[in-house]
């Protein structure tokens, strides 16, 4: 089922990302640089292990995980979080927890695009990727 996500994706649009980062608690300086970045996302699968890489002028990150198993993640904005990613109806649901806070990132395929929906409390950001 994750095969639909495999490949290299480039960011083509971003909506409400600064407001989302503010709600997460990201400082101004980090928000500014992160908001300007146009990351490529590279997703691969090897057996049970899924790898998601993000590459940009801001920061390069990589996570490798097994669905449903909690793992440690250092986010691009430098949060040290506990993450769990599950597959729910074809949607990769990524929950990050840190400092008593929680945010959810949903990755889903829509037509030929990969849509990433970031939710923190009542604030939602939608970022759309196309195949590179």
């Amino acid at each position: 089922m994750c095969d639909a996500f495999v490949g290299t994706w480039k960011l083509v649009s971003s909506e409400n990302f600064d407001d989302y980062m503010k709600e997460v608690g990201v400082g101004f300086a980090t928000r500014k640089v992160a908001g300007m970045a146009k990351p490529n996302m590279i997703i691969s699968v090897n057996g049970d292990v899924i790898t998601i890489k993000s590459e940009s002028t801001f920061k390069n990150t990589e996570i490798s995980f097994i669905l449903g198993q909690e793992f440690d993640e250092v986010t691009a904005d430098d949060r040290k979080v506990k993450s769990t990613i599950t597959l729910d109806g074809g949607v990769l649901v990524h929950v990050q927890k840190w400092d008593g806070k929680s945010t959810t990132i949903k990755r889903k395929r829509e037509d030929d695009k990969l849509v990433v929906e970031c939710v923190m409390k009542g604030v939602t950001s939608t970022r759309v990727y196309e195949r590179a």
Epitope: K22, G25, V26, G27, F28, A29, T30, K32, V33, M36, A37, T57, F58, K59, T75, D77, D78, R79, D99
Partner: antibody, heavy 119, light 108 residues
């Protein structure tokens, strides 16, 4: 260990310019922004601006926009701040500091460069 | 710009005394972005508390931080001689980043 090395002092004449340096070591230079802070004798701290070495992106406090120019040389892991049209008001200690992402606090500081503007 | 008002500006405390320094912020900020620094004479500021309540490396556990929204504080549970210094609060939520004017803490 993380270190930010700054020259101890600079003496320059009014109207001149000066380029202050901040050499970073002990971490990946392009991973964290470098910020600059001014402290006049006996006074508090003022944020001048910051630069992200990975992208070269800068943000200046409006108050210092025409005064300070921030640059980096990634090959030598050094950040620079050029101060122009110097007056006695620019006499101060200038610190560089590393910005720790997310929280955006200054987790490592240089020793500071004491700039004296005098004829 | 966001103004940080520290109080008191100057205070003296005896060894063993509890000390509280407050930082009032002119508009609400994320608690993740309120920080405290300690500075002693002729030396660089040191990160002391970040994200309102996280102690920086090497900071004694007698220090603590709390607050949210527009009201924050730094507390020393039992004053020691080495705590005499100037403490600055700083916000990183909004442009430009700003500092409080500082609280000078002296040993009585």
């Amino acid at each position: 260990q993380v270190q930010l090395q700054q020259p101890g002092a600079e003496l320059v004449k009014p109207g001149a310019s000066v380029k202050l340096s901040c050499k970073a070591s002990g971490y990946t230079f392009t991973s964290n922004a470098i910020t600059w802070v001014k402290q006049r004798p006996g006074q508090g701290l003022e944020w001048i601006g910051d630069i992200s070495p990975g992208s070269g992106s800068t943000t200046n406090n409006e108050k210092f926009k025409s005064k300070a120019t921030l640059t980096v040389d990634t090959s030598s892991s050094t950040a620079y701040m050029q101060l122009s049209s110097l007056t006695s008001e620019d006499s101060a200690v200038y610190y560089c500091a590393r910005l720790r992402g997310y929280y955006d606090y200054f987790d490592f500081w240089g020793q500071g460069t004491t700039l004296t503007v005098s004829s | 710009e966001v103004v940080l008002t520290q109080s008191p500006a100057l205070m003296a405390a005896s060894p063993g005394e509890k000390v509280t320094i407050t930082c009032s912020v002119s508009s609400s900020i994320s608690s993740s972005n309120l920080h405290w620094y300690q500075q002693k004479s002729e030396t660089s500021p040191k990160p002391w508390i970040y994200g309102t309540s996280n102690l920086a490396s090497g900071v004694p556990v007698r220090f603590s931080g709390s607050g949210s929204g527009t009201s924050y504080s730094l507390t020393i549970s039992s004053m020691e001689a080495e705590d005499a210094a100037t403490y600055y609060c700083q916000q990183a939520s909004h442009y430009p980043l700003t500092f409080g004017a500082g609280t000078k803490l002296e040993l009585k």
